[in-house]
Interface confidence: low
Amino acid sequence: CRTSECCFQDPPYSDADSGSASGPRDLSCYRISSAGYECSWQYEGPTAGVSHFLRCCLSSGRCCYFATGSATRLQFSDQAGVSVLHTVTLWVESWARNRTEKSPEVTLQLYKSVKYKPPLGDIKVSKLAGQLRMEWETPDNQVGAEVQFRHRTPSSSWKLGDCGPQDDDTESCLCPLEMNVAQEFQLRRRRLGSQGSSWSKWSSPVCVPPENPPQPQVRFSVEQLGRDGRRRLTLKEQPTQLELPEGCQGPAPGVEVTYQLQLHMLSCPCKAKATRTLPLEKMPYLSGAAYNVAVISSNRFGPGPNQTWHIPADTHTEPVALNISVGTNGTTMYWPARAQSTTYCIEWQPVGQEGSLATCNLTAPQDPDPAGMATYSWSRESGAMGQEKCYHITIFASAHPKKLTLWSTVLSTYHFGGNASAAGTPHHVSVKNHSLDSVSVDWAPSLLSTCPGVLKEYVVRCRDEDSNQVSEHPVQPTETQVTLSDLRAGVAYTVQVRADTAWLRGAWSQPQRFSIKVQVSD
């Protein structure tokens, strides 16, 4: 027989199948040109000394063979003696060490058996009613196909599924979607209505994330507020990476989970923009304001659950950076200015009313005045900070007020509003005898003492009504008692107390008269 023809004789070996687990398998035959055909197969087991024979039986019952030696691929033409227009049955017999191993048979019409391609190019993945939908363009001249898929997770082996018949320029498949694990999919195709024809190769992996992106397990820390009024937000713990199936490890697109940082500045609500979204790698600097920080995880199906943290305001206060002057026309604040053309946000809130909205004002961009100060003024009629109570004032600055991450804290301090001089006057001044020449003076704490850093000191004044001599005694702001000594018995004294701030002398309390009784000895 000629090597290019199928030989209609008995093959040169004994026809006994060894029943071995090794041997030829996965035979596929198809047309590769108008008159050319190809069959190929796999051989499992040791290949030394193995000879392969492609067997073919026609519908008439006549059978022939091609001897291919050690090759597992054979090309032949429609002139090789094999009927290409009628159904034929093909299989491989591999002969080695005096025994024969047979492949499973395939029955097909060779002329109609076109080598089908797997889905190529871009496979679009979307979610449809809790299932996964894959869609791709049908390879050229291959409309009409059966499609199968196989899928696996990081912990499972391949499972086979059926996409059903396809008969259009685009093909699609509905597949199961896992809630919490990533999956790898592959697809293959074969000609529709030709059960004996061979399947295409499997497509490249399609990597699909779980329906729910994983909850981002991250932790933040915030550095101390620097001298520039900013503090760095740092990531203490990176998000855990998703476990991936074998074919999706490496730079496989599709399963990526992206994490974004959403920053919401709670202080200064009158500024232009309160929220900003950044990539998680780009950790920002923050002002000393309070923030909510959310980490949003998202994959190709959209955003998943997010985690939110509250970053409290930096409570460190500057004792004297803010100067407030109250005049007849109104009130002006002065503070050390930042660079040229800086916008300031001034926010204040009565102490103890932290749950309520702070009053917030945005200045026009302003340059430092000749003394290097920035200012903000308001009229008396506005009633702002007019009540006699303690206010917490924070001033923020930015040269780019619409950029949330470029705000910084200028100062944070306390101020007693209204007529602090009168409101701060100590009440309930009482005098008790202490010894033969001394008394103890007590008073109730000034309202100013509720305002951290505002009360500089108490001053106790004692006047001798006989001689009109006056002595003044400074007292620490934390004390509400002082002992007056070297007093004379029988002399009338008056005592008064006042509370002073750094920039304001308080009003004296009502005079309290007392005297030390003369001790009469028996």
């Epitope: 009158c270 909205l357 009053t359 917030c360 009629e381 506005s382």
Partner: nanobody
Framework: QVQLQESGGALVQPGGSLRLSCVVS????????IGWFRQAPGKEREGVSC????????IYSDSVKGRFTISRDNAKNTVYLQMNSLKPEDTGVYYC????????????????????WGKGTPVTVSS
Amino acid sequence: QVQLQESGGALVQPGGSLRLSCVVSGFTSDYFAIGWFRQAPGKEREGVSCIGSSDGSTIYSDSVKGRFTISRDNAKNTVYLQMNSLKPEDTGVYYCALDRGRRTIIGYACYATMKYWGKGTPVTVSS
């Protein structure tokens, strides 16, 4: 509903003056910011000047500081823009806009995100 009606736009020579008026109706809040914006042909809309409702605090863009003055007459629900020493670059459609006081007692906010807008009045400065 809230309505703003501008008037006073005209053709004027460089160095001349104009006074724009904006009448507000249908707005009842005590606290609001109101202002003037302009849009030159082929350019973005920009803030010119704004005024706060309660304390009368004002804000001006650098390009008009010292030449334009914003004022208001609460009784007439009207805001004015007095424009002096006009220049060709002041040409454009001038819009009046209003927004409520953004959680602020005595503040103002002069942004293109104002909630209510008038239809505009054209100002042309040309010789």
